[in-house]
């Protein structure tokens, strides 16, 4: 199965020489970035990137690891330290505060410094930190948020919200005491904290009053509105902008993205999180790639540029379920969105960053043969004389004992999209991991992305590259032909 050309040292020497030649040609651009795009793979640790690369190759009938992901082509790479102020292993709220606002916070808080305490409403005021997206808007750029989760979820919320509890999606989730103290739910903050030009993802139910049927699932009360304040937040948002459009399905999205009269676009395609890519109804729900393209079509109309946050948010969910198939297929769709964005933008004026908020206790090992399925079995047997998969989790719901023993596994079982990889420790949900994650960079000022950095560095690189606060005196040449 080993390609015969790989047996020849010339193959490797030639390949490395080409890579070296490309590296020698790299010239740090001294220009400012007109546009900023941050691609956030939620839970996309390095083991996830590697496994997804192999899967992407194998889907194209290749052996796997020699394949390039779109993110692999980014010329600059750093490592990001993801810990939060209070935890070695963080959540998506504290990390969003770090890479979007440039300040580390506490576990499960969003858009607040570490002086704020989880779930304590009265520690909110005065501890708010401002996102790069907010700063980009103040500088006259258009801004957008695209995610496969709820748009009120922890990662996207880092761009616009300030909350001591990431779970306060709608006012129904906020305790009465916190509401009385003036703490607002994330959905309310989405439409009131700042003017976001493009909002695409899931999360319809948090925008409407309880008793409002969902347009896609009108007979399912569990998918209907959840709000208790009587507000229709979509209606309120539409009233703020003359060119605003709300859509809830793929067809409407594609139409709206091509309509020159649309200046603001909100697309909410599921009541909660969007469906996994493998379960997506392609007639009703857009893919992450399609949402990214739609966002770029609208945002790129602004001559002053744009800021765009794009999240592959359900990589994380697949891992929490210990279903590597789901996590890896989500990662591939995320990578497809990165590739499409690269085709629609220029690295001359657009700084693109790809990173993860945190990793997962997801491992890839066992000496599998080159070309063997990423979802397959390791050669040989374990000490209990049973097979084991090359993908495993340190903890999670894949832990099963049958008659006091670990169950055996076959290749056909492990290849199923529903299969949960085994783990060493039984938990309802697999946990995040604390190791550093990669940051990939391309475009103006991408060369700043180097070494091992705090996760907060990412926000500062973006702000500096686009000459946003606090780096308005960035002393970078505007890109030739930039209009103001």
């Amino acid at each position: 199965i080993i390609p015969v050309e790989e047996e020849n040292p010339d193959f490797w020497n030639r390949q490395a020489a080409e890579a070296l030649g490309a590296a020698k040609k790299l010239q740090p651009a001294q220009t400012a970035a007109k546009n900023l795009i941050i691609f956030l793979g939620d839970g996309m640790g390095v083991s996830t990137v590697t496994a997804a690369r192999i899967l992407k190759g194998q889907k194209k009938d290749k052996l796997g690891p020699e394949t390039f992901l779109a993110m692999d082509r980014f010329p600059y790479v750093a490592l990001s330290k993801t810990y939060s102020v209070d935890k070695h292993v963080p959540d998506s709220g504290a990390t969003a505060t770090a890479y979007l606002c440039g300040v580390k916070g506490n576990f499960q808080t969003i858009g607040l410094s570490a002086a704020a305490r989880f779930n304590q409403c009265n520690t909110t005021r005065g501890n708010e930190v401002i996102s790069v997206m907010n700063r980009a808007k103040k500088a006259g750029k258009s801004v957008g948020v695209v995610t496969t989760t709820r748009v009120q979820h922890a990662s996207p919320a880092g761009a616009y919200a300030h909350t001591v509890n990431r779970n306060w999606y709608s006012d129904a989730d906020v305790p009465a005491s916190a509401r009385q103290e003036g703490c607002q739910d994330i959905a309310t903050q989405l439409i009131s904290n700042m003017d976001i030009d493009v909002i695409l993802g899931g999360g319809r139910k948090y925008m409407f009053p309880m008793g409002t049927p969902d347009p896609e699932y009108p007979d399912d009360y569990s998918q209907g509105g959840t709000r208790l304040d009587g507000k229709n937040l979509v209606q309120e948002w539409l009233a703020k902008h003359q060119g605003a459009r709300y859509v809830w399905n793929r067809t409407e999205l594609l139409q709206a993205s091509l309509d020159p009269s649309v200046t603001h676009l909100m697309g909410l395609f599921e009541p909660g999180d969007m469906k996994y890519e493998i379960h997506r109804d392609s007639t009703l729900d857009p893919s992450l790639m399609e949402m990214t393209e739609a966002a770029l079509l609208l945002l790129s109309r602004n001559p002053r540029g744009f800021f765009l946050f794009v999240e592959g948010g359900r990589i994380d969910h697949g891992h929490h379920e210990s279903r590597a198939y789901r996590a890896l297929t989500e990662t591939i769709m995320f990578d497809d969105a990165i590739e499409r964005a690269g085709q629609l933008t220029s690295e001359e004026d657009t700084l693109s960053l790809v990173t993860a908020d945190h990793s997962h206790v997801f491992s890839f090992g066992g000496y599998p043969l080159r070309g063997s399925s990423i979802f397959g079995l390791a050669p040989g047997k374990a000490r209990d004389r049973k097979a084991y998969t090359v993908l495993l989790y340190g903890n999670g719901p894949g832990y099963v004992l049958k008659d006091g023993a670990r169950p055996d596994v076959t290749e056909s079982e492990s290849g199923s999209p529903e299969y949960r990889q085994q783990s060493a420790v039984p938990l309802d949900g697999e946990t995040h991991a604390g190791e550093d994650v990669a940051v990939f960079a391309r475009g103006p000022q991408a060369h700043l992305v180097h070494g091992v950095q705090e996760q907060t560095f990412i926000a500062h690189v973006m702000a500096f590259a686009a000459c946003l606060e606090p780096y308005t005196a960035c002393d970078l040449a505007p890109r030739a032909g930039t209009t103001d």
Epitope: W168, D173, P209, M210
Partner: antibody
Framework: QERLEESGGGLVQPEGSLTLTCTAS?????????MCWVRQAPGKGMEWIGC???????TWYASWAKGRFTVSKTSSTTVTLQMTSLTATDTATYFC?????????WGPGTLVTVSS | IVMTQTPSSKSVPVGDTVTINCQAS????????LGWYQQKPGQPPKLLIY???TLASGVPSRFKGSGSGTQFTLTISDVECDDAATYYC????????????FGGGTEVVVK
Amino acid sequence: QERLEESGGGLVQPEGSLTLTCTASGFSFSSSYYMCWVRQAPGKGMEWIGCIYTGNDDTWYASWAKGRFTVSKTSSTTVTLQMTSLTATDTATYFCARGLSPIDLWGPGTLVTVSS
Amino acid sequence: IVMTQTPSSKSVPVGDTVTINCQASESIYNNNNLGWYQQKPGQPPKLLIYWASTLASGVPSRFKGSGSGTQFTLTISDVECDDAATYYCAGYKSRTTDGSAFGGGTEVVVK
């Protein structure tokens, strides 16, 4: 199969206390649910007691129940109803219910008899 | 909130139509947070209609809910013997004291 089951009912002395437990199976409160208690005196209608929202542990009650009855979430699958200063008028079948509007899942009920 | 249900009892021949009314003391939440439940002896209630007019899963279309704000109606057409039960309306107003309530119930006897 999603189910609710009440336990802890029985005979209690006037002015006594009792705690009823509602155990969920087939789902857990790691997702947010409204969990309510409703009672029905023999031959009478349904009477709402109070609810808890498991997403943030907010509780609210009927005015007649406030102070004497307490709804709590005790685990990811159990909710309790603590009742104090019971009188004969509290004799009823007590139902645990999931949902607020609508209630979509009911337990079979547990009978509480207050008598000396 | 207080829910007043009328009539308290109704006798109806098989095949006829029965109408049950429910009045809220004030507008319920979103004007539609009202449910109708059917209870048979020895059993917990069963959801029939939610959000005033939406038929619950598995419930025959003979059951119809209507109304908004404070006035609501449950209509059972082509009544069958199996429809003999007590019917309750339940309204939700707010997540505060006395924010939910059941109506007094209507016993439907099928002749």
